[in-house]
């Protein structure tokens, strides 16, 4: 009988203290003098001193009102001793249970709590979560059990009713319908925490449910109609900025404009983009207008928006009058650029050909020709008629001013508007190939050994162009052929130089006569340098000294 | 053994203020409560308080609600008492008691005299 | 408050007497009954606790009883040094007080 059953003591008691609590009792108090004393967290170690015994009778006493939310329970343990400090009883366990008094309120986790709803959701759509705590038990009491409510809406349109909350999850929902972020673009709710699920102390906070824009508003044109003025041929220009309102969230996806030409534009000369700022349509020419093909173009252009409507709308449609301005046209030359093939070399004054150039405008003006640029010199144009002739001699073989047969001219055609303007054309005259270049061997100076000689082979090189060319054929005049014998391969690109007798060592003029293909002959005289010496020599060794 | 030793004697004016205290060993201090007890020359005994050693919570008797203060320092095992206003009246033997509810151990007592 | 009368007020007794001092508490107080001796200039000492408790070291001559309103405290045999006031007190409700006191003198 040396037990006691758990004691539960009320937090927050009144006292008066020490309070009795039990009274621990040995049986063995019957035979001798007992002392009682008792060990233990809350009795001889921290926190110490909130329970005691009084030693002579056993009562168990508490010392100060508990707190169940810093402890809930205590373990103590119960000591029995005789007169002589003899243990007369083993360790008696005491458990001491503090139970709950509703002595808190609930505690929000946040004062403002915020959250966000996409406008024009049906009703039952979840919003947020919120969450208050209460240190009071929950488990074997309602005293921490929190129940949750809102106190009030503002503002209160379109109704004071357009959420709800769960009582016991805190989870905030959309019980109407009718949110619209236009109107009403956030709503503040006092929202209630009650401990006693719902019948105790009241605690209260703020949750600021912000509007999501949803993109149930079109963008409208203001105003619907424009009228612009272009001058013709300008590329990139600035037609017209147009403008548009949105109720949607500015700068959002459901704001942003896109703009969609959707007729007028049937030779696709305009383009719209939007301004990332003013998120104007900015239409512009994609190519230049014609005045005299078209003066005036109506276009019709449609605006939507970035994100696609949430539901159906009817979008809006502005139409722009465009006026296309005549300016006075630069002459163009037809074609631009004039490809003519003329033989060189012919005649001073001979025609080349006729480049002209067309006035877009209709107006009859009168066109004046000139050259812009000939590098060389060779050629002259009528500046009426546009008539190019010869007036130096065109040569496909001139290196500096011919690229691949290719002389290339500009001309310019000047027209009497007011003020004038001019156009260039580009003459590219292919010059034919006139076989007026003999063949001409290289090298032209050669040394060889006047005993053993090495056969001398000679590259032949013709500036005109096949069939003007190879195979060439080789000749020796002026008695040459007495000493050397020259001989073309078979390939006819190169001729052999060979010393058929003996010479001394001296310098030799060799005359060799080359001929193309076209009888084109030239006359070379090849510088010989004959040196005393066997087979292959580069320099003539000097005179041999005996010793 | 248990001892508690208390302050030496006090002659005050009315009007003052008289602070007792009372140093205790041979227990664990803050297990227990110190109670307060005058005796008036020729008069019998008179609880005025008593106060929890480890917490400081403290209980009065209502005669001297308002005008007693008691007060412990742990770090010293010393519990005081603080009568403030003294009139004539208030001239008795202060004694410290240690107990629960009964009283198992006394001071040697601390006379407080108040005179003009 | 608790009023707790003690009789008689003063005695006269012989060395070997049995002496009977009477408590009676205004209201209930259980056993929360206890009883000190004080001998002039000195402070009470403690007897009895919980009205029938001997505190150690107190002789068996000194003995207590009653519960509820009514307790009484017997010396068996009176010693000498048994010659004292000696006071009541409840500790059942605050404020705890005291009886008057009983002077026991030699006859």
């Known amino acids: 009988d040396w037990v006691v059953a758990p004691i539960s003591v009320p937090e927050n008691g009144k006292g008066p203290f020490p309070q009795r609590l039990n009274q621990l009792k040995s049986n063995k108090d019957r035979d001798t003098k007992i002392f009682y004393s008792i060990t233990g967290p809350g009795a001889d170690s921290p926190p110490e001193g909130v329970f005691a015994v009084e030693k002579e009778t056993g009562w168990l006493l508490l010392n100060k009102p508990l707190d169940r939310e810093e402890i809930a329970k205590y373990e103590l343990f119960g000591h029995a001793v005789s007169e002589n400090g003899a243990s007369v009883e083993d360790p008696m366990n005491i458990s001491i249970i503090v139970t709950d008094q509703n002595d808190h309120k609930p505690k929000f986790t946040q004062d403002t709590f915020r959250g966000s709803v996409l406008e024009g959701v049906l009703p039952g759509t979840s919003v947020m979560q919120v969450t208050a705590t209460d240190e009071d038990d929950a488990i074997y009491t309602y005293n921490g059990v929190v129940a949750y409510s809102i106190h009030s809406q503002e503002p209160k349109d379109p109704h004071d009713l357009m959420f709800t909350i769960h009582r016991s999850t805190g989870t905030i929902s959309v019980i109407s319908s009718g949110l619209d972020r236009e109107k009403v673009p956030e709503y503040t709710l006092t929202i209630q925490a009650t401990d006693m699920d719902g019948d105790g102390s009241t605690t209260t906070a703020v949750a600021v449910v912000e509007i999501l824009d949803a993109n149930d508003n079109a963008p409208m044109f203001d105003p619907q109609k424009y009228e612009a003025h272009v001058p013709e041929n300008a590329v990139g220009h600035e037609v017209q900025r147009l403008t548009v309102t949105d109720l949607d969230a500015p700068n959002s996806p459901a704001w942003r404009a896109t703009y969609l030409i959707m007729g007028g534009d049937d030779g696709d000369h305009f383009t719209i983009t939007t301004h990332p700022e003013s998120n104007q349509g900015i239409l512009t020419t994609r190519k230049g207008l014609d005045f005299e093909a078209k003066n005036q173009h109506t276009l019709y252009v449609e605006v939507t928006n970035e994100a696609p409507f949430v539901l159906k709308l009817p979008t809006s449609t502005a139409t722009i009058v465009v006026h296309v301005e005549d300016v006075n046209e630069a002459p163009v030359f037809v074609p631009p650029s004039k490809v003519v093939e003329v033989q060189e070399g012919i005649p001073t004054g001979e025609p080349v050909c006729v480049y002209t150039a067309e006035d877009p405008d209709k107006e009859n003006q009168k066109i004046s020709y000139r050259i812009l640029r000939d590098p060389a010199g060779w050629l002259a144009m009528d500046p009426d008629s546009g008539q190019v002739t010869a007036v130096g001699t065109l040569d496909r073989e001139d290196e500096q001013f011919v690229r691949n047969n290719i002389y290339e001219v500009m001309v310019l055609a000047m027209d009497n508007g007011s003020p004038p303007t001019t156009g260039t054309g580009t003459l590219l005259l292919t010059l034919i190939d006139v076989n007026d270049h003999g063949p001409v061997p290289e090298p032209r100076q050669i040394t060889i050994c006047n005993q053993s000689p090495v056969r001398q082979v000679l590259n032949i090189t013709d500036k005109d162009l096949s069939p003007h060319t190879s195979p060439f054929q080789a000749q020796l005049t002026d008695d040459s052929d007495i000493y050397w014998t020259a001989e073309v391969n078979e390939e006819g690109d190169t001729v052999v130089l060979s010393l058929k007798k003996f010479l001394k060592q001296d310098t030799y003029d060799v005359h060799l006569s080359l001929s193309d293909h076209g009888n084109k002959e030239q006359l070379t005289v090849i510088r010989a340098t004959v040196c005393d010496c066997h087979g292959h020599v580069e320099t003539c060794p000097g005179p041999w000294k005996g010793g | 053994q248990v001892q508690l030793v208390q302050s030496g004697a006090e002659v005050k004016k009315p009007g003052a203020s008289v602070k007792v205290s009372c140093k205790a060993s041979?227990?664990?201090?803050?297990?227990?409560?110190m109670h307060w007890v005058r005796q008036a020359p020729g008069q019998g005994l008179e609880w005025i308080g008593n106060?929890?050693?480890?917490?400081?919570?403290?209980n009065y008797a209502q005669k001297f609600q308002g005008r007693v203060t008691l007060t412990v320092d742990k770090s010293s095992s010393t519990a005081y008492m603080e009568l403030s206003s003294l009139r004539s009246e208030d001239t008795a033997v202060y004694y410290c008691?240690?107990?629960?509810?009964?009283?198992?151990?006394w001071g040697q007592g601390t006379l407080v005299t108040v005179s003009s | 408050d608790i009023q707790m009368t003690q009789s008689p007020s003063s005695l006269s007794a012989s060395v070997g007497d049995r002496v009977t001092i009477t408590c009676k508490a205004s209201?209930?107080?259980?056993?929360?009954v206890s009883w000190y001796q004080q001998k002039p200039g000195k402070a009470p000492k403690s007897l009895i606790y919980?009205?029938?408790n001997r505190f150690t070291g107190v002789p068996s001559r000194f003995s207590g009883s009653g519960s509820g309103t009514d307790f009484t405290l017997t010396i068996s045999s009176l010693q000498p040094e048994d010659f004292a006031t000696y006071f009541c007190?409840?500790?059942?409700?605050?404020?705890?007080?005291f009886g008057q006191g009983t002077k026991v003198e030699i006859k």
């Open positions: 007190e409840q500790y059942s409700s605050y404020p705890f007080t």
């Open positions: 919980w009205a029938s």
């Open positions: 106060i929890q050693l480890s917490y400081g919570n403290t």
């Open positions: 209201q209930n107080v259980d056993t929360d």
């Open positions: 041979g227990f664990t201090f803050t297990s227990y409560w």
């Open positions: 008691a240690r107990g629960f509810s009964y009283f198992d151990y």
